[in-house]
């Protein structure tokens, strides 16, 4: 049986049940290669409390559909008197990056995971030439996830004192220049994740090969190498390579630019101080507030919730968007879709789509950007579920009693962007990270 998601095959992936201190290793095409789980384990569970290993999914006992992968085992489990077998179930959803498997829950018999990934899309529009896993768990099983830094189009410029060259990078995947409006970047060779431009010439100085690594707490490393044989004439016989070290800052701060810290014979060392390198719980919340010792800040957007069936309305040319954030109030137009953001076509108001659901909410504060994300909306033709990204700006003089109002700023591939100026986005900092 052919592997259902070949892009995911090259790596062993990790997921964590934080509540129970359990680390899962997952290899969807082969076995995880952990002796304690046996030679054919596709999903190996490491219980760190009891220091035991169990195979909870066998690579030989795999069954697959386009959106579900199940690994059975021969191990019996007793669930309400029935004689079931232990199994793992991975539900796949279309995403814009390779993504990460997320642990959902476990019963006595079934271990459930969810994975939003390009590999599950109906169309190839989000697929990279080359992409590697872009997250890592540290020794305390805290997740560090650089997926939000991945650019689907374009690149980051590395701060470099050399006026004659420009070094462009992407994170964990190659640079896509298809949307380039005609700049230097367009000359970059396909597949490169680190592109050096000198004058009108562009050179591949690194492609992603291995996934993100953690070197020590709050320092993550990504390495790119030039795959192609044939040395570049300005590299003195060496093969180019790029090492990017992502550093979690010691206290809250605005984002910084990736900086070139060393360069010798086409070996480029880059340091990027960014809060995305910090563990995810420091940056994100599933509620509309971020506060406490863990986050070093106090943010509370709950006053933006609308009661009594009213919604914020944002005009989007052909569409109207109805938003009801930070609550579970149904938007009247949205046909009981549990939508936090509802898209209604002006010319035909029966055409209604959920552009993100209130149960699928993430509040993120990172590198000075405050963002509320709603995902899991109605599917687009690519298979990607519509999502909305609301970028908040602090405005102490916002109208509407300080609440302000969301402004639609555009749509890219079924992701709807809004900006929202409000006094409730003014962040209060504590200083003790």
């Amino acid at each position: 049986q052919a592997a259902p998601f070949p892009e995911l095959c090259s790596y062993t992936w990790e997921a964590v049940d934080t509540k129970n201190n359990v680390l899962y290793k997952i290899n969807i095409c082969g076995s995880v290669d952990i002796v304690q789980c046996g030679p054919s384990s596709a999903v190996c569970m490491h219980d760190l409390k009891t220091r035991t290993y169990h195979s909870v999914g066998d690579s030989v006992l795999r069954s697959a559909t386009r959106s579900l992968l199940e690994f059975n085992t021969t191990v019996s489990c007793d669930q309400q008197g029935t004689n079931h077998r232990v199994q793992s179930s991975i539900a796949f959803l279309c995403g814009k990056t390779l993504g990460t498997p997320e642990f959902v829950t476990a019963t006595e018999c079934v271990h459930y995971f969810e994975w939003r990934t390009t590999a599950a899309c109906k169309k190839d529009i989000f697929k990279a030439n080359k992409e590697v896993p872009c997250y890592v768990f540290d020794e305390e099983l805290r997740k560090h996830d650089l997926n939000p830094l991945i650019k689907l189009s374009g690149a980051y410029l590395v701060d470099d004192s050399d006026p004659d060259t420009s070094l462009f990078i992407n994170v964990c995947r190659d640079i896509d220049t298809l949307r380039d409006p005609g700049s230097q970047l367009r000359a970059c060779p396909p597949g490169t994740a680190a592109c050096l431009v000198r004058g009108h010439q562009a050179f591949d100085v690194g492609q992603p090969r291995d996934g993100l690594k953690v070197v020590r707490k709050d320092r993550l490393v990504l390495s790119y190498v030039r795959e192609e044989a044939g040395k570049l004439d300005f590299c003195d016989g060496h093969s180019p390579a790029v090492t990017i070290t992502f550093v979690c800052p010691s206290e809250r701060r605005e984002g910084t630019i990736p900086k070139l810290t060393a360069k010798s014979n086409c070996r480029y060392e880059i340091e990027w101080i960014t809060e995305y390198a910090c563990h995810r719980d420091y940056l994100e919340s599933k509620t509309c507030s971020l506060s406490g010792e863990q986050q070093d800040v106090s943010i509370d957007l709950t006053p933006l919730a609308q009661s009594g069936g009213s919604s914020y309305i944002s005009d989007g040319k052909e569409y109207l968007f109805y938003l009801n954030v930070c609550g579970e109030t149904e938007i009247q137009f949205c046909n009981k879709k549990q939508a936090a953001v509802c898209q209604v076509k002006k010319s035909d108001t029966s055409q209604v789509k959920a552009a993100g659901r209130y149960h699928n909410q993430t509040l993120r504060y990172s590198d000075g950007d405050l963002t509320l994300i709603y995902f899991g909306g109605d599917e687009c033709s690519s298979g990607f579920q519509r999502m909305s990204v609301i970028n908040f700006e602090c405005n102490k003089t916002a109208g509407n009693d300080g609440k302000g109002t969301p402004v639609f700023t555009g749509e890219v591939d079924c992701t709807y962007e809004f900006t929202w100026d409000t006094e409730y986005a003014c962040v209060h900092h504590h200083h003790h990270h």
Epitope: K151, S153, S166, F168, R179, Q184, T409
Partner: nanobody, 123 residues
Framework: DVQLVESGGGLVQPGGSLRLSCAAS????????WGWFRQAPGKEREFVAA????????SYADSVKGRFTISRDNAKNTIYLQMNSLRPEDTAVYYC????????????????WGQGTLVTVSS
């Protein structure tokens, strides 16, 4: 490629104000970072201001900080440059441009240049 048309230039006295507009055609408007640049006679094209597409984060050349403001109206696919307290040294042709590179002020990282609009500051 994106097509850009700048407007709003003209003759203004020192200390005066102008608002430049840049209309962009193309539905990928909001996938770009946008910049204003200027070129005075006999000089290199220089960075003035930029705005990131995914948020309202802005950056400015030191020479215009506190006097110029870049903004955008995504509904109208338009970028603006509000110029206050104008000085004779602000005289130049002003261009807007698009880039898919984050954190850049380098003109060679921008493309789809418009034809420019002339701003003259003189008494």
């Amino acid at each position: 490629d994106v097509q850009l048309v700048e407007s709003g230039g003209g003759l203004v006295q020192p200390g005066g104000s102008l608002r430049l507009s840049c209309a962009a055609s193309g539905r990928t408007f909001n996938t770009y970072n946008w910049g204003w640049f200027r070129q005075a006679p006999g000089k290199e094209r220089e960075f003035v201001a930029a705005i990131r597409w995914s948020s309202s984060k802005t950056s400015y050349a030191d020479s215009v900080k506190g006097r110029f403001t870049i903004s955008r109206d995504n509904a109208k696919n338009t970028i603006y440059l509000q110029m206050n307290s104008l000085r004779p040294e602000d005289t130049a042709v002003y261009y807007c441009a698009a880039s898919i590179v984050d954190f850049t002020t380098n003109p060679s990282h921008f493309g789809s240049w418009g034809q420019g609009t002339l701003v003259t500051v003189s008494s």
